[in-house]
């Protein structure tokens, strides 16, 4: 008799999830010498332990602490790039500007990027059929709690000037409900962080409008200023040229703002 399985609203665990996490861990530790000491089997065991046999709507940050401990990593605190709703460009940027880091350039972020996972209460099975949706089912699900935990720690580690890339093609350029708006903004440490500099990325179409004047950017400025952190904002009018100029800063066409 097949046992009843909870049907959630979100997609199930990414296929070959254990193998993917383990392979990513091995690859990351090979590429990053400072993380060579990490035992990837232990990392997987800690990752698994955070959600296996637990109700997928009842996950806590505490569940991820063993994984956090194993994945402890020091990135230059003044080279942090946050992003909201514009992950691809942020990652393209740090691939070129190698001394800057997004969360997904750290071990833990790299392991989980674009993956979904959840288990079932009282069984050691991984649920490949469905996982809880943040909106429709519950917010304390394995994926959401993971990203909330690592995002908070990443923001807490930041210092000096912190950059954030924001999507100017969205109705809410700054969204209070995004991970950036709900977690990272509130965990920047005013005693360490001097300035948050927002880069508003314009869409593919040419435009002359100053999106730093958008009401949601003003809202971000207000939140940041109240936390005694300075705020600045730049328009990136041409993201393609922006990346090109990061690659080749001496190019003569890279003198104007992009």
């Amino acid at each position: 008799v097949p046992r009843w399985r909870q049907q959630w609203s979100g997609p199930g665990t990414t296929k070959r999830f254990p193998e993917t996490v383990l392979a990513r861990c091995v690859k990351y530790t090979e590429i990053h010498p400072e993380m060579r000491h990490v035992d990837c089997q232990s990392v997987w065991d800690a990752f698994k332990g955070a959600f296996i046999s637990k109700h997928p709507c009842n996950i806590t940050e505490e569940d991820y602490q063993p994984l956090m401990k194993l994945g402890t990593q020091t990135v230059p605190c003044n080279k942090i790039l946050l992003w909201s709703r514009i992950k691809d460009l942020a990652h393209q940027f740090t691939q070129v500007q190698r001394d800057m880091f997004t969360l997904e350039d750290t071990l833990l972020g790299y392991l989980a990027d674009d993956l979904t996972w959840c288990g079932e209460f009282n069984t050691s099975k991984i649920n490949y059929q469905s996982c809880p949706d943040w909106r429709k089912d519950c917010s304390n699900n394995p994926v959401s709690v993971f990203w909330k935990t690592v995002s908070r720690r990443f923001a807490e580690a930041a210092c000096d000037v912190v950059h954030v890339m924001l999507n100017g093609s969205r109705s809410k350029i700054f969204d209070k409900n995004s991970t950036f708006g709900s977690v990272e903004v509130h965990n920047l440490q005013p005693e360490k962080v001097q300035t948050l500099e927002a880069w508003v990325i314009h869409g593919g179409r040419e435009d002359s409008r100053d999106l730093c004047q958008d009401p949601t950017i003003k809202e971000l400025e207000s939140i940041i200023s109240k936390r005694n952190i300075q705020f600045s904002c730049k328009n990136i009018y041409r993201p393609d040229k922006f990346l090109q100029c990061v690659k080749n800063p001496e190019d003569s066409s890279c003198t104007s703002e992009i």
């Epitope: 109705s171 179409r205 435009d207 002359s208 328009n235 009018y237 104007s256 703002e257």
Partner: antibody
Framework: QVQLQQSVSELRSPGSSVKLSCKDF?????????MSWVRQKPGHGFEWIGD????????FYGEKFEDKAKLDADTVSNTAYLELTSLSSEDSAIYYC???????????WGQGTLVAVSA | DIVMTQTPLSLSVTPGQPASISCRSS???????????LHWYLQKPGQSPQLLIY???NRFSGVPDRFSGSGSGTDFTLKISRVEAEDVGVYYC?????????FGGGTKLEIK
């Protein structure tokens, strides 16, 4: 051929409101192109009221018109709207909608709607 | 707001002769993205404005090549190499480098 079709002339009394419409016959580009509203008063040239990007509802207003005008757009009917409130004789003008042809360049203009405010 | 000043206020030209209209802005129209958003429109009698030249020197589709634009920074010029009868109307320069977008007061072109 007509690309932007504006509503007919309006006669209003002071203190009232009026809502003008602008139908775009290019349904492909309407949602992702800014639609501006510009007014022309005799002897005053053109004044830019503001613009709206229909698909995400982003709006920019000229400072002078922030309390006077309200922009709106419906991506189902491909129609942009301009509502003018607390009308006075100063608001008597021809109101044009104009869609950008390229970024920030007004390439296509409606035929204009005459708004007359008179007691 | 950026003030756009056009000269002359009006001009009367013989068909086949050249015409030139000047437009000056109260601050530079060179945008930080490298473009200069200075445009020219023609409003023929009883009609809506029509775009002639965009970003200083680019002719809009369908605009005859007798129309040309030039300039940079704060000083711009519209030239008609050989005026034709259909060119009558009021010519306006406009900037969209900085919000709010603004227009010149217009130059009325008549045929002699």
């Amino acid at each position: 051929q007509v690309q932007l079709q504006q509503s007919v002339s309006e006669l209003r009394s002071p203190g009232s409101s009026v809502k003008l419409s602008c139908k775009d016959f290019d349904s492909e580009v309407f949602p992702t192109s800014y639609m501006s509203w510009v007014r022309q008063k005799p002897g005053h040239g053109f004044e830019w009221i503001g613009d709206i990007l229909p698909n995400i509802g982003r709006i920019f207003y000229g400072e002078k018109f922030e309390d006077k005008a309200k922009l709106d757009a419906d991506t189902v009917s491909n129609t942009a709207y301009l509502e003018l409130t607390s009308l006075s004789s100063e608001d008597s003008a021809i109101y044009y909608c104009a869609r950008e042809a390229y970024g920030s360049i007004l390439g296509y203009w409606g035929q204009g709607t005459l708004v007359a405010v008179s007691a | 707001d950026i003030v756009m000043t056009q000269t002359p206020l009006s001009l009367s030209v013989t068909p086949g002769q050249p015409a030139s209209i000047s437009c000056r802005s109260s601050q530079s129209l060179l945008h930080s993205n490298g473009n200069t958003y200075l445009h020219w429109y023609l409003q023929k009698p009883g009609q809506s404005p029509q775009l002639l030249i965009y970003k200083v020197s680019n002719r809009f589709s369908g605009v005859p090549d007798r129309f040309s634009g030039s300039g940079s920074g704060t000083d711009f010029t519209l030239k008609i190499s050989r005026v034709e009868a259909e060119d009558v109307g009021v010519y306006y320069c406009s900037q969209s480098s900085h919000l709010p977008w603004t227009f010149g007061g217009g130059t009325k072109l008549e045929i002699k």
